[in-house]
Interface confidence: low
């Protein structure tokens, strides 16, 4: 369908029409001041140049002001994540002004047309902010624009066009198509606010990436690598909804950014932490759990401003639902020797035992081949707070790299029935907690018995030297 108001054409004319004529047509961008956390309150519509609604609706000039900006819509109505976000903001910041930017008429278009409308919507927001700045006590530094999907780029335009600098922009899975690789003035970028933080939850290296893959903020956070979100698989969606489809999977992963942000508002006592890393694979190897030199940060609303950083990519794992927080551990396992391993690639499993709880049996994801006579690094994470770790149980299984190798193993076994069992020799495991930054070394319970066959278990306890309390906590990050 054609755009009723082109990006530079009719809507721009519409905005400059005399007031008497303007009221005949519903404005394509409306500003709904949410006066209560209850979604039932219809709120108040603010009108550029009209101070009365500000007074009638109790707009607080000295408080924080949030602008929530929705994205492209197929339905033409507000989606339900919106009232969750409004409610969470009101709960967390009781005196704040929460404004929903309603640009539904311009977003309920063909995607390409909606993209073309983002600039003019950003311009409308900038004009509203310029007008508010004329009021006593209103500070642009107190303004936080929160944009979801296409709305994130709208926020970028608003930040770019406004006179002065907006305090913060949060991009919730900024839209990818038509923005990936675009010039910084045509997408959300770090120049658009004093602090730009971004959550990426639906990025794909191949196929259509609904969310933008490239970093576009001061900090760019990629939960679960920024691609496959737990609880959003087709099976999960089909299980929880009678009408689950691929569309629901897309919605679940794309919208996860919003729910992570809501989680950061309402579960303040369970903050999720992200860790700076050059790429997702290195993070999966457990290499990047440092908090030195601002290398870790809270995600969502609690993120600490790091202006010196530019396009800092950060990663974390999450649960499938609220609260999303998990507890990250780096595990360093030195494999001293293989015995009769052939072509078999070991898969390790650990169970962690702590003062508060015990974990489930956790597989150690192998990103690269297990190296012999070398230290192998892994990332594990638990949904529960285990407290201080007391002991670790380790097992392993042989997983063949190919059917051909499996056949070779079987043939070798059949031709040499008395072939002694395969074994690995592991004497210690070093563990670092991402959340506490504590390091600990675990030694084999029986130093004389450090060899382990498939399916057998080896127990490790804290080494006698105990805790190595290397505190790497950055002063800008308050770790729990």
């Amino acid at each position: 369908s054609p755009t009723p108001f082109g990006p530079e054409g009719q809507l721009a004319d519409e905005l400059h029409k005399p007031k008497a004529i303007q009221t005949e047509v519903k404005p394509s961008v409306r500003f709904n001041l949410r006066t209560s956390k209850d979604p039932e309150h219809e709120g108040c519509y603010l009108s550029l140049g009209h101070s009365q609604p500000l007074e009638d609706c109790g707009f607080n000039m000295t408080a924080k002001t949030f602008f929530i900006i929705h994205g492209w819509t197929m339905s033409g109505i507000f989606e339900n994540w919106l009232h969750k976000l409004v409610s969470a903001l009101h709960t967390r910041e009781k005196d704040a002004n929460v404004v929903v930017v309603d640009w539904l008429p311009l977003a309920h278009q063909l995607y390409t047309d909606a993209v073309n409308n983002t600039r003019v919507v950003g311009h409308s927001i900038a004009r509203m902010l310029d007008w508010l700045q004329e009021k006593d006590d209103f500070s642009l530094g107190n303004v936080h624009l929160i944009g979801y999907s296409l709305g994130a780029h709208v926020a970028g335009y608003a930040g770019n066009f406004v006179k002065g600098t907006v305090g913060r922009i949060t991009g919730l899975d900024p839209a990818g198509p038509m923005f990936e690789g675009a010039d910084i003035h045509k997408r959300l970028s770090p120049d658009d606010a004093d602090f730009v933080d971004v959550l990426h939850t639906y990025t794909r290296s191949f196929g259509l990436s609904i969310g933008i893959q490239m970093p576009v903020g001061h900090i760019d956070i990629y939960p679960n690598g920024g691609d496959f979100q737990p609880g959003c698989g087709l099976n999960d969606v089909l299980g929880s909804m009678a009408y689950g489809t691929i569309t629901e999977v897309v919605k679940c992963e794309h919208e996860r950014a919003v729910h992570l942000f809501v989680d950061s508002l309402v579960n303040q006592d369970k903050p999720s932490f992200a860790f700076q890393c050059t790429d997702s694979n290195r993070f999966k190897k457990g290499i990047c759990l440092s908090c030195r030199k601002n290398r870790c940060n809270s995600i969502g609303y609690n993120a600490k401003k790091m202006r010196n950083k530019r396009n800092s990519k950060m990663y974390l794992k999450t649960r499938a639902g609220m609260p999303f927080r998990v507890y990250h551990y780096q595990m360093k396992i030195h494999v001293f020797s293989y015995k009769n391993m052939g072509e078999i690639e070991p898969t390790f499993y650990v169970t962690l035992y702590g003062t508060n709880a015990d974990s489930q049996t956790l597989p150690l994801e192998i990103v690269e081949r297990i190296e012999q006579n070398a230290t192998n690094t892994f990332l594990v994470y638990t949904e529960e707070d285990l407290g201080d770790l007391l002991k670790i149980q380790l097992t392993w299984e042989g997983a063949s790299q190919s059917w051909y190798n499996l056949w070779k193993e079987l043939r070798s076994y059949l031709s040499q029935p008395h072939n002694p069992g395969r074994e690995l020799n592991i004497r210690r495991i070093r563990v670092k907690s991402g959340e506490t930054q504590r390091k600990l070394t675990f030694c084999a319970e029986d130093p004389e018995n450090t060899s382990i066959s498939p399916g057998r278990e080896l127990w490790f306890r804290k080494c006698r030297d105990g805790w190595r309390m290397k505190n790497e906590t950055s002063p800008t990050v308050e770790l729990p």
Epitope: S36, P39, E40, E42, C44, F78, N80, K84, S87, V100
Partner: antibody
């Protein structure tokens, strides 16, 4: 299709409590707030309060806040409204109503549950 | 709390006639919502945001007003329109309803 099915009629003595259920189906339960509205015989409609199934957060009419408790069970997509210290004037039809998209209205209503308070 | 007063309490009209129902708020509200209720049934929304027709509601129903005075108009009464009509506000909690206007056949 969206359906709100309420529990059956109840007869209670003054001072007792009543717990009315409202089972939702045909939509994602946690995405819409649920409200309770009552109507005394031959009288108008009276809003009692609401529950947000996503968080379990509640908002009550001051008039009932000391006597009403709204809860939800996400596993069964059911909301409950319990009214305690019943008096004869609490005799009414109690409706659950789903609050529609964000800045909307009550778009779906339960069939109503008649609660009679009599000694 | 905001008190909504509806008038008249009863409106006796014939099919085909125009019905005008009034709702006055004790203090200013942003928008008004109108519901229709028939005996033994749950209410059904007619008008939201003062003047917007709810899905599936015929165009003979319309709403208007602002501030404290609001009106529901039925341009030409059909037999199925004879019922009780309630106005409601969502501006401030508790969300209140008017006492209702009964539209009956003359």
């Amino acid at each position: 299709q969206v359906q709100l099915v309420q529990s059956g009629a109840e007869v209670k003595k003054p001072g007792a409590s009543v717990k009315v259920s409202c089972k939702a189906s045909g939509y994602t339960f946690t995405e819409y707030t649920m409200h309770w509205v009552r109507q005394a015989p031959g009288q108008g409609l009276e809003w009692m309060g609401s529950i947000n199934p996503y968080y379990g957060g509640t908002s009550y009419n001051e008039k009932f806040k000391d006597r009403v408790t709204m809860t939800r069970d996400t596993s069964t997509s059911t909301v409950y409204m319990e009214l305690s210290s019943l008096r004869s004037e609490d005799t009414a039809v109690y409706y659950c109503a789903r609050y529609g998209n964000y800045v909307g209205y009550f778009d779906y209503w339960g069939q109503g549950t008649t609660v009679t308070v009599s000694s | 709390e905001i008190v909504l007063t509806q008038s008249p309490a009863t409106l006796s009209l014939s099919p085909g006639e125009r019905a005008t129902l009034s709702c006055r708020a004790s203090s200013s509200v942003h928008y008004m919502y109108w519901y229709q209720q028939k005996p033994g049934q749950a209410p059904r929304l007619l008008i939201y945001y003062t003047s917007n027709l709810a899905p599936g509601i015929p165009a003979r129903f319309s709403g208007s007003g602002s501030g404290t005075d609001f009106t529901l108009t039925i341009s030409s009464l059909e037999p199925e329109d004879f019922a009780v009509y309630y106005c409601q506000q969502f501006t401030s909690s508790p969300y209140t309803f008017g006492g209702g206007t009964k539209v009956e056949i003359k």
